[in-house]
């Protein structure tokens, strides 16, 4: 399987909220002995590979933000800890998972990574990740709503 990032760049005004999204693509084994560990973290375009460095999002580590479930289930992170930091990560039945960040500040700008670990017992873990950039802007040049740029082309979309 692979991870797709529908949008590679999110440009948002300060104070707005944004939902960063990843999607599982390809054949996903839904056997009882297969589970998925999904999480989010900040990173940099590192020397080893993009997303190899893991930094917290608003002081929450990838462990704090993880989603964990089998192939058929939807899941949410523990609400209390994440919501206190204006964050919520979620996953649906169709392979899409996301992190929502409320009340954006300039400090939220940077590279964000989603990580999916397919845990096939008796086999090694299979990791895939996706990367996207968030730019938070302030002042007269900032957009009124988040503008997202698809990964495939550079046509932008407004999201409210």
């Amino acid at each position: 399987f692979k991870v797709a990032t529908p949008y590679s760049l999110y440009v948002c005004p300060e104070g707005q909220q944004v939902t960063l999204t990843c999607r599982l693509l390809g054949p996903v084994d839904k056997g009882h002995d297969v589970t998925f560990y999904k999480t989010w973290y900040r990173s940099s375009r590192g020397e080893v590979q993009t997303c190899s460095e893991r930094r917290p999002i608003r002081n929450l580590t990838f462990q704090d933000l993880h989603l964990h479930h089998g192939g058929h289930q939807a899941a949410n992170t523990s609400h209390d800890l994440a919501q206190r930091h204006g964050l919520e990560s979620a996953s649906d039945h169709h392979g899409q998972f996301s992190i929502t960040m409320r009340n954006l500040t300039l400090l939220d700008s940077g590279l964000y990574c989603c990580l999916v670990v397919e845990i096939r017992h008796h086999h090694s873990e299979h990791r895939v990740h996706g990367a996207m950039e968030l730019q938070v802007q302030t002042g007269k040049d900032a957009p009124s709503n988040c503008v997202v740029y698809p990964s495939s082309s550079q046509d932008s979309e407004n999201i409210t």
Epitope: D33, T35, Y37, V48, Q49, S52, E53, R54, F62, Q63, H66, H68, G70, L115, V117, I119, H121, H122, H123, S124, E125, R127
Partner: antibody
Framework: QVQLQESGPGLVKPSETLSLTCTVS????????WSWIRQPPGKGLEWIGY???????NYNPSLKSRVTISVDTSKSQFSLKLSSVTAADTAVYYC???????????WGQGTMVIVSS | EIVLTQSPATLSLSPGERATLSCRAS??????LAWYQQKPGQAPRLLIY???NRATGIPARFSGSGSGTDFTLTISSLEPEDFAVYYC?????????FGGGTKVEIK
């Protein structure tokens, strides 16, 4: 703050079964691998195997024929059974939490098990 | 199974000196390598995961580098509490395996 505590007999006779339990406190047993690791006196670390909170297991092939790891989520405990022990199984046995795509981030303090008649 | 070879077996240094520990894998482990510190009578403590990511609460003087088969743990300036045994561990393949350890002792 998640803490792990091993418990079980410190002395086991050769050919018998070693049984240990690890109690997880201060956090959920869900979402992680729960492993057993051992360390013979003065030697290095050896991974024995893990159980996933869902009950799926994975064992070190070198011990697979003798090892059983089980979980009781209602008690937040997981257990190790090692059959047909010999003096070579004398070691400090650790339980540990293993995070997917990461490492063993939380360890019990370890319990010494001596195999002797 | 993947064999991890650590060198040197013992490193004799003084507080304040720089320590460089090596871990070599028998085949590529990408960057899926962790480092642990173990003091006598204690359980190991996670220092680094994925070759260079410091675990929560680990001081900045500990840093990891490398990918593929060759990895390094560096302690930039040894503190008295850093004298211990250090182990590397791979997680690209099951069974998970550890190196034989490097003892960092006071010179």
């Amino acid at each position: 703050q998640v803490q792990l505590q091993e418990s079980g007999p410190g002395l086991v006779k050769p050919s018998e079964t070693l049984s240990l339990t690890c109690t997880v406190s201060g956090g959920s047993i869900s979402s992680y691998y729960w492993s057993w690791i051992r360390q013979p006196p003065g030697k290095g670390l050896e991974w024995i195997g893990y159980i996933y909170y869902s009950g799926s297991t994975n064992y070190n092939p070198s011990l697979k024929s003798r090892v059983t790891i089980s979980v009781d989520t209602s008690k937040s405990q997981f257990s190790l059974k090692l059959s047909s022990v010999t003096a070579a199984d004398t070691a400090v046995y650790y339980c540990a939490r293993d995070i997917p795509a990461s490492a063993f981030d939380i360890w019990g303090q370890g319990t010494m098990v001596i195999v002797s008649s | 199974e993947i064999v991890l070879t650590q060198s040197p077996a013992t490193l004799s240094l003084s507080p304040g000196e720089r320590a460089t520990l090596s871990c070599r894998a028998s085949q590529s482990v990408s960057y899926y390598l962790a480092w642990y510190q173990q003091k006598p009578g204690q359980a190991p403590r996670l220092l680094i995961y994925d070759a260079f990511n410091r675990a929560t609460g680990i001081p900045a003087r500990f840093s990891g580098s490398g990918s593929g088969t060759d990895f390094t743990l560096t302690i930039s300036s040894l503190e008295p509490e850093d004298f211990a045994v250090y182990y590397c561990q791979q997680r690209i393949n099951w069974p998970l395996t550890f190196g034989g350890g490097t003892k960092v002792e006071i010179k």
